[in-house]
Interface confidence: medium
C-alpha cells in the first residue's frame, strides 16, 4: 500500500544489447516520479535515475562492473513534488524487476561484415569485432574479449545468381571459404552463443556482395 496518489511501477523489463542495458517499466507517470535501485544478489542497493519522470533507466554503468553477476532492480514511486512522502507502511511503493545476468542474457547486436577479400578461389570474410561498454583497465572490451570461446559467428553465403545458401562457422572473427572462380557471392553473418538457452543468436548482418566497395578481389 502507498499514498493514494502514487501507483507502483509494473512490467519491469530489461532491454540489453551488447551489454548496453536499460530497465524499462510502466506506467507513464501522472503526478509521480520514480527512482531506480540496482543490486547484485549479495550486494547493497545503489540508487540511479533519481526522481525521474522517464519510464526507463540506463543501468549499463552498473552491470558492466561484473557482467557475470546476477542483478536485481527495483523501481520506487513517489508523489511529484513531495518525494519525502511515503506509503502507509512508511516506505514508498516499489516493484522488483526480474533477475538479470548480463553474460547469459544480453542480446547479441547485429554484426557487421568489416571486409572480404578474394584470393583466387578463396574468400576471407572478416566480421567487425564490436566494441562493448564493458571495461578492463580503462579500455573498452570487444564482444570477442568478453565472450571469448563462447561466441561464434555463422556465415551464410550464396552465389549472386542463385538462392542456395551455404554456411560456415568460426570461433574467431574470420572465415576462409572456397568459392567458384568467376562467380560473385553475397554474404551475411550472425553472432551465436551456442551454450546459451535464451538469446542465442543475433539478427543477421546486412548482406554484402562481391563487386561492391567493401570487398577486394585479387586474382592469383
Amino acid at each position: 500500500s502507498g499514498t493514494t496518489n502514487t501507483v507502483a511501477a509494473y512490467n519491469l523489463t530489461w532491454k540489453s544489447t551488447n551489454f548496453k542495458t536499460i530497465l524499462e517499466w510502466e506506467p507513464k507517470p501522472v503526478n509521480q516520479v520514480y527512482t531506480v535501485q540496482i543490486s547484485t544478489k549479495s550486494g547493497d542497493w545503489k540508487s540511479k535515475c533519481f526522481y525521474t519522470t522517464d519510464t526507463e533507466c540506463d543501468l549499463t554503468d552498473e552491470i558492466v562492473k561484473d557482467v557475470k553477476q546476477t542483478y536485481l532492480a527495483r523501481v520506487f514511486s513517489y508523489p511529484a513534488g513531495n518525494v519525502e512522502s511515503t506509503g502507509s507502511a512508511g516506505e514508498p511503493l516499489y516493484e522488483n524487476s526480474p533477475e538479470f545476468t548480463p553474460y547469459l542474457e544480453t542480446n547479441l547486436g547485429q554484426p557487421t561484415i568489416q571486409s572480404f577479400e578474394q584470393v583466387g578461389t578463396k574468400v576471407n570474410v572478416t566480421v567487425e569485432d564490436e566494441r562493448t561498454l564493458v571495461r578492463r583497465n580503462n579500455t573498452f572490451l570487444s564482444l570477442r574479449d568478453v565472450f571469448g570461446k563462447d561466441l561464434i559467428y555463422t556465415l551464410y553465403y550464396w552465389k549472386s545468381s542463385s538462392s542456395g545458401k551455404k554456411t560456415a562457422k568460426t570461433n574467431t572473427n574470420e572465415f576462409l571459404i572456397d568459392v567458384d572462380k568467376g562467380e560473385n557471392y553475397c554474404f551475411s553473418v550472425q553472432a551465436v552463443i551456442p551454450s546459451r538457452t535464451v538469446n542465442r543468436k543475433s539478427t543477421d548482418s546486412p548482406v554484402e556482395c562481391m563487386g561492391q566497395e567493401k570487398g577486394e578481389f585479387r586474382e592469383i
Partner: antibody, heavy 121, light 107 residues
Amino acid sequence: EVQLVQSGAEVKKPGESLKISCKGSGYSFTSCWIGWVRQMPGKGLEWMGIIYPGDSDTRYSPSFQGQVTISADKSISTAYLQWSSLKASDTAMYYCARHKLGMDHDAFDIWGQGTMVTVSS
Amino acid sequence: DIQMTQSPSSLSASVGDRVTITCRASQGISSWLAWYQQKPEKAPKSLIYAASSLQSGVPSRFSGSGSGTDFTLTISSLQPEDFATYYCQQYNSYPPTFGQGTTVEVK
C-alpha cells in the same frame, strides 16, 4: 601429426572407481574442445560431454550429468573421463574426439582409438 | 533433445554401386550435420561436416547434401573399403545427437 591416444582397456568390478585418459598431440591442445562418446556393445554412438582444456570449462549431456566427470590437465595435454562408482551398464567402448574448429558447437574431426571398459562382478 | 533418424538401418550393395543414406532431424538443424564412418572394432572416422563439406583426406566419391531436417550421404561408386556403418550427427543444439547408424553390407 594430429592425434588423440587413449589409455588401455580396463576390467573393473561394480562399485569401483575409474579414470581413463586421452592425450592430444600435434595441435594446440588448450584451444580445442575435446568430447567423449560412448558406444555400448552392438549399439550406436552417444555424445557424453566436452571439455575446453584451456580453462576446464565442461558441458555434459543431460543423460550423463552426474554420472561421470570430465576433466583435463593442460600441462600434459590430457583429458580424462572418470567414474566414482561403476555399474555393469557402464560396460562400453569410450572414444575421445576433437571438435573440428575448437568450438563447443561443432563436428568432431579427430578421434582416439577408444578405451574398452568392462564392468563385471 | 533432437532425434536423428537414419534410413535404411542396413542395406546390401555391390562394389561400384551408388549408395544413398538419409538422415532426418526431428526439428530444423540448418546445415549443422556431420557424417561418420565406423568399421568393426575401429574408431569412427569423420567424413563430412556442415552437411556437405568433405573432411580433409576423404575421397571425393563421398558427398553430403541437405539442409533443415532432411540430409543425404551419397557414395557415388562403392569401393571394398566402404563397407561399414555410417552415422549422422547433428550439432545445432545441445546435446549433439547421433542417428542410430546405417550398415552397408556386401550383397
